[in-house]
């Protein structure tokens, strides 16, 4: 988790002088509770946005937006702590909005936004906005949390982000798999424009089962520059097992930008359709 590196982060708006600061996720008001604390945020919304760095790289970011409740506690609101927690790694990153002037009620509801937390493709997050100061130990909570899911690199907008392109999202191998005689599969795919090796992983399954009955790995050496964007054809020999008829072919590239963590592409060959048992043809014709 990190913050997007472009521009000075701003939270000021007409009628409010505000600065964005890094935070340890442990606000001082936890340690030194205050008697009077503001109410919780209202209508917290988290959306996926995209933003460029100063270097021109495009990253997915969490766009966080919330409003203030229209009660008197606005007079005691000193700022907000924004926290993003990556669920599986338990990694947390926080920033603090520090209000340098007192908030006053005005003709429309106060609204705040922040779009600088960089998020990873295909990951899950919890976003929390805490109003400051935080409540006394037994006080009513004054935060709001929402979970947030980032699409993977198959998603149209995600595909062109820097982290997705680094893991090979622009490579479309257009895999075709053809069943040949004598228990063989012909796999064909388009090579990318990099001199890197590939691996074909074949997993076979019985019809309607999810436990594999055959696995095979085939190594494809790095192509020469004149072979870039050309089709590579490989013939794989299957184990002659009755009913082991559904085949999943997965191609794993080893591009320099993602090494052994590149996006894999796969194709599946289903078991052949079993024809309905035909009616037996009688060997004589009745005469009625």
């Amino acid at each position: 988790l990190r913050l997007l590196d472009h521009r000075a982060l701003v939270c000021s708006q007409p009628g409010l002088n505000c600065t964005v600061k890094n935070s340890t996720c442990l606000d001082d008001s936890w340690i030194h509770p205050r008697n009077l604390t503001p109410s919780s945020p209202k209508d917290l919304q988290i959306q996926l946005h995209f933003a460029h760095t100063q270097q021109g790289d495009l990253f997915p970011v969490a766009h966080i937006e919330w409003t203030l409740q229209t009660d008197a506690s606005i007079l005691y609101l000193e700022g907000a702590e924004l926290s993003v927690l990556q669920l599986n790694t338990n990694e947390r990153l926080c920033v603090r909005f520090e209000f340098l002037s007192k908030l006053r009620h005005h003709h429309r509801r106060w609204r705040f936004t922040f779009s600088h937390f960089v998020v990873d493709p295909d990951q899950e997050y919890e976003v929390t906005v805490h109003h400051l100061p935080k409540p006394i130990p037994d006080g009513d909570p004054n935060h709001q949390s929402k979970n947030f899911l980032v699409p993977d690199c198959e998603h149209a907008r995600m595909k062109v982000t820097t982290p997705c392109m680094s893991s090979g999202s622009l490579w479309d191998p257009n895999i075709t798999v053809e069943t040949l005689e004598a228990h063989q599969l012909r796999v064909s795919f388009t090579l990318w424009n990099e001199s890197t090796h590939y691996q074909i992983l074949l997993t076979s399954f019985p019809h309607m089962e999810n436990h594999s009955c055959f696995e095979h790995m085939h190594h494809i050496p790095a192509p020469r520059p004149e072979e870039f964007h050309q089709r590579s054809n490989v013939t794989l020999t299957l184990r002659n097992l009755k009913g082991c008829c559904r085949h999943q072919v997965q191609i794993q590239p080893f591009f320099s930008s993602c090494l052994n963590d590149c996006l894999r592409h796969s194709a599946t060959v289903s078991c052949p359709e079993m024809p309905d048992t035909p009616e037996p043809i009688p060997d004589y014709m009745p005469l009625w």
Epitope: D43, Q45, I46, L87, N88, T89, N90, E124, S145, K146, N147, L149, P151, D261
Partner: antibody
Framework: QVQLVQSGAEVKKPGASVKVSCKAS????????ISWVRQAPGQGLEWMGW????????NYAKKFKGRVTMTTDTSTSTAYMELRSLRSDDTAVYYC?????????WGQGTLVTVSS | DIQMTQSPSSLSASVGDRVTITCRAS??????LNWYQQKPGKAPKLLIY???NRESGVPSRFSGSGSGTDFTLTISSLQPEDFATYYC?????????FGQGTKVEIK
Amino acid sequence: QVQLVQSGAEVKKPGASVKVSCKASGYAWTRYGISWVRQAPGQGLEWMGWISTYSGNTNYAKKFKGRVTMTTDTSTSTAYMELRSLRSDDTAVYYCARRVLRLDYWGQGTLVTVSS
Amino acid sequence: DIQMTQSPSSLSASVGDRVTITCRASQDIDSSLNWYQQKPGKAPKLLIYAASNRESGVPSRFSGSGSGTDFTLTISSLQPEDFATYYCQQWANMPGTFGQGTKVEIK
């Protein structure tokens, strides 16, 4: 091919404990959390909690807090769910699933029967 | 906890029919909703995530829509393999609660 393979059916007496395992393959184990969901016979799905495969951090549904423990073994890419002080209404199929918010791959389920 | 209410609890339909299942949340959950399909004796299968995104490999006849508190799963042309029970699940806040399920039966 992503696969989650669970341990076999169990029959337990009331008051006993059960430990269900869930072995994952076909993806980077520490990239996604593991959730546990149960389903009583003829009933709907009930979320029990999840565990981070990266940090071991857990998040349990209130109903199961104090009675459930979720753990992982990174060396074998296996998650475990232990439920203690079993009651007859814990009779259910227990599923593990990959991820926390979007449960995209599921184990085949483990039937736990609690009967005296 | 957020309550999820599905309707109808069961329905009868024929192959080729257009089927609509609705799910209502007890509070605003944005688009934080998934749909699952479960066949007897099998584990649930993810169909739609984040209200409207079809999971990889799911046929295009399945679609999801809605935001806030009201959501819909639509099967545009029911196929024989679609007869199953369907569950919605919210993940805006933990615990991730499920609807009670909608059983789609053959008419």
